[in-house]
């Protein structure tokens, strides 16, 4: 299972998010509603389900949020694009685990992501995308807690080998 823990440069992603967090959250027209259901929902996830939930949440952001969001500010767009790109590479790394049948999705894990998608569907698409971007810190904190995250200084010691 350890091979399915993504090792990525979270400093870069978190720095990018911190630079745009205030601007994104200021656009949130439903501050009392949550999509990621606060950190508590993610806290109850068992170690066995971490790979699956990570995979599903990456897909949620890559396939829904980053596609639905319309960003007029070029500087913010650049930061969001950078985060999205990092997520895409994380997603591709986890796909290796799926191919090796090391990222099994149990019902509990599937339920967590279903709730998040349901929450997203309750809002108009643009509002849902903005809110989900504003809640990225919840997902990033969870990744930091559950994966072998690397700082920029140490990251060069780590690499993945791609299957043939």
């Amino acid at each position: 299972l350890r091979r399915c823990l993504i090792s990525t440069d979270m400093d870069h992603i978190e720095d990018s998010f911190q630079e745009i967090k205030r601007a994104i959250q200021a656009k949130d027209t439903f501050p009392n509603v949550t999509i990621l259901s606060t950190l508590e929902t993610l806290q109850i996830i068992k170690p066995l389900d971490v790979c699956c939930v990570t995979k599903n949440l990456l897909a949620f952001y890559v396939d829904r949020v980053f596609k639905d969001h319309q960003e007029p500010n070029p500087k913010i767009l650049r930061k969001i694009s950078s985060i999205a790109n990092s997520f895409l590479y994380m997603q591709k790394t986890l796909r290796q685990c799926q191919e090796q049948r090391q990222c099994h999705c149990r019902q509990e894990a599937t339920n967590v992501t279903r709730v998040i998608h349901d929450n997203y569907d309750q809002l108009e698409v643009r509002s849902a995308a903005v809110k989900s971007l504003g809640e990225l810190d919840i997902f990033l904190a969870w990744i930091a807690k559950n994966h072998e995250v690397t700082s920029s200084a140490a990251a060069h010691h780590h690499h993945h080998h791609s299957g043939s």
């Epitope: 090792s7 990525t8 440069d9 400093d11 870069h12 890559v62 396939d63 980053f66 596609k67 969001h69 960003e71 767009l77 650049r78 969001i80 694009s81 950078s82 999205a84 790109n85 997520f87 895409l88 590479y89 591709k92 796909r95 290796q96 191919e99 690397t150 920029s152 990251a155 060069h156 010691h157 780590h158 690499h159 993945h160 791609s162 299957g163 043939s164």
Partner: antibody, heavy 122, light 107 residues
Framework: QVQLVQSGAEVKKPGASVKVSCKAS????????LHWVRQAPGQGLEWMGW????????NYAQKFQGRVTMTRDTSISTAYMELSRLRSDDTAVYYC???????????????WGQGTLVTVSS | AIQLTQSPSSLSASVGDRVTITCRAS??????FGWYQQKPGKAPKLLIY???SLQSGVPSRFSGSGSGTDFTLTISSLQPEDFATYYC?????????FGQGTKVEIK
């Protein structure tokens, strides 16, 4: 000017190592993943792997596992690809290529170096 | 590894012709796919990414379609500068792989 400039041609003997450099200019080096692709004479393209210049993280195609090392020096915006235990079938043009950063996210090598010919011959 | 099979391996066409190149993947790769053009002695050039998105600066006569296992590159009206070799690339699964190439020659 946005470009990737690679080091010059190399001639190596079988068993030796080669280190090809790729210097980026005109854009933020740490903001884009860099890939290495090679092309044997008269043949098609072959993906070797990538490096994240920001973190130094890498992912290598298994075919090159144990023989390839991708590194970078952010202070001079340069990436390196070192291939060891060279064989005659490693004779190829080696390219570095930058990945696009777009929304929604996708892969695409939008900027390429001019290529470095590595000849392995006894 | 996922294999990409391009067809035809070569074709002859005239300026103004509509040209279609296909690429078939050995398994479902969603839309994690691109097309590149390469001229002799030059580095490849990105034409299409994400199966159908046209790269900035690429003429609109180039278009890409398909998802899953079957993909198509279409040049609506072949121009003199389009005579080159075209490669497809899948980035769905590691190792990322290219097709063997399709050479477009002048008839």
């Amino acid at each position: 000017q946005v470009q990737l400039v690679q080091s010059g041609a190399e001639v190596k003997k079988p068993g030796a190592s080669v280190k090809v450099s790729c210097k980026a200019s005109g854009y933020t080096f740490t903001g884009y993943y860099l890939h290495w692709v090679r092309q044997a004479p008269g043949q098609g393209l072959e993906w070797m792997g990538w490096i994240n210049p920001n973190s130094g993280g890498t992912n290598y195609a298994q075919k090159f596992q144990g023989r390839v090392t991708m590194t970078r020096d952010t202070s001079i915006s340069t990436a390196y690809m070192e291939l060891s235990r060279l064989r005659s079938d490693d004779t190829a043009v080696y390219y570095c290529a930058r990945d696009i950063v777009v929304l929604p996210p996708a892969i695409g090598f939008d900027l390429w170096g001019q290529g470095t010919l590595v000849t392995v011959s006894s | 590894a996922i294999q990409l099979t391009q067809s035809p391996s070569s074709l002859s066409a005239s300026v103004g012709d509509r040209v279609t190149i296909t690429c078939r993947a050995s398994q479902d790769i969603r839309s994690d796919f691109g097309w590149y053009q390469q001229k002799p002695g030059k580095a490849p050039k990105l034409l299409i990414y994400a199966a159908s998105s046209l790269q900035s600066g690429v003429p609109s006569r180039f278009s890409g379609s398909g998802s899953g296992t079957d993909f198509t590159l279409t040049i609506s009206s072949l121009q003199p500068e389009d005579f080159a070799t075209y490669y497809c690339l899948q980035d769905y699964n590691y190792p990322w792989t290219f097709g063997q190439g399709t050479k477009v020659e002048i008839k």
